[in-house]
């Protein structure tokens, strides 16, 4: 077990803070909840603290919760491939470019680390080149979320990982908006981290609303499990 992994044996409180600017529309979001890496479970609620969110909530899910991939459940035979936990408590920097097909792009930079007993994800997001009447600024996405696989590979040069995946957002007219994600994670501290073999995270997310909440918000329940690396031959013959 890595030193960082020991921090995730129970339920851990999570705080998310985002400052965003999309085509000049500035906004802030606060999120709170908890993660349980034993089950790969995340429960979070997000509030737009600046009024109405200028973009659809689903476009921010990867920035929020795919930001705290340290809560992914890594099966016993894959624990040596868990970069995310091994970087804790000092944490990691996570940078992404998200290209929305036939529309604009988000660039995000986040620092994910422990502050006391709380896992904090602080994010800056800049979005440019969006069409004012497109699927994103025109709020044409459905309020739901599909399952996805998130592909991870080691980046030995940077002592981190590279991550690629394609998100499918459902549009109200029945079509799909694709969002290509290019991600890079590098440790903040200078301690040893685990550099993985290629594998993927399987994610399932459910979006809902709090009937008692008057502010613009999103409630998120997510399960994430690592897969794609089989047991070694010695395991098969036990």
């Amino acid at each position: 077990m890595s030193k960082g992994e020991e921090l995730f044996t129970g339920v851990v409180p999570i705080l998310v803070e985002l400052d965003g600017d999309v085509n000049g529309h500035k906004f802030s979001v606060s999120g709170e909840g908890e993660g349980d890496a034993t089950y790969g479970k995340l429960t979070l609620k997000f509030i737009c603290t600046t009024g109405k969110l200028p973009v659809p909530w689903p476009t921010l899910v990867t920035t929020f919760s795919y930001g705290v991939q340290c809560f992914s459940r890594y099966p016993d035979h894959m624990k040596q491939h868990d970069f995310f936990k091994s970087a804790m408590p000092e944490g990691y920097v996570q940078e992404r470019t998200i290209f929305f097909k036939d529309d604009g792009n988000y660039k995000t930079r986040a620092e994910v680390k422990f502050e006391g007993d709380t896992l904090v994800n602080r994010i800056e997001l800049k979005g440019i080149d969006f069409k004012e009447d497109g699927n994103i600024l025109g709020h044409k996405l459905e309020y739901n979320y599909n399952s996805h696989n998130v592909y991870i590979m080691a980046d030995k040069q940077k002592n981190g990982i590279k991550v690629n995946f394609k998100i499918r957002h459902n549009i109200e007219d029945g079509s799909v908006q694709l969002a290509d994600h290019y991600q890079q994670n590098t440790p903040i501290g200078d301690g040893p981290v685990l550099l993985p073999d290629n594998h993927y995270l399987s994610t399932q997310s459910a979006l809902s609303k709090d009937p008692n909440e008057k502010r613009d918000h999103m409630v998120l329940l997510e399960f994430v499990t690592a897969a794609g690396i089989t047991h070694g031959m010695d395991e098969l013959y036990k």
């Epitope: 409180p13 999120g31 709170e32 603290t49």
Partner: nanobody
């Protein structure tokens, strides 16, 4: 040394509004869980409202639901209690409280009284 400095309060007619502020100083780690309590004349101190570290989760006593709103501005290290539709029975000394032990953990009982730090109290008087 952590300090809670309260402001606002005063006298108002029934049906009026007041806003209380509570600014925290002396600690820069994660924002604490914050709450407002009140003590009415001849009564025990009672819970009024609480807010989680990021301001996402809010809790209210039944007696103030729909009339009072708790909010926070973490950039200013300040928590507010907006009190609307005030009634004579809201007359009390109002205290803000901070709890660092809760940290970012929202899944707690906000109604407990064992907060780490307390403000000096602010008198609110509502006349009919």
């Amino acid at each position: 040394q952590v300090q809670l400095q309260q402001s606002g309060g005063g006298s108002v007619q029934a049906g009026g509004s007041l806003r209380l502020s509570c600014t925290i100083s002396g600690r820069t780690s994660i924002n604490p869980y914050m709450a407002w309590f009140r003590q009415r004349p001849g009564k025990e101190r009672e819970f009024v409202a609480a807010i989680s570290s990021g301001g996402v989760y809010t809790y209210y006593a039944d007696s103030v639901k729909g009339r009072f709103t708790i909010s926070r501005d973490n950039a200013k290290n300040t928590v507010y209690l907006q009190m609307n539709s005030l009634k004579p029975e809201d007359t009390a000394v109002y205290y803000c409280a901070a709890d660092f032990r809760r940290g970012g953990n929202w899944n707690v009982d906000p109604f407990r009284y064992d907060y780490d730090y307390w403000g000096q109290g602010t008198q609110v008087t509502v006349s009919s």
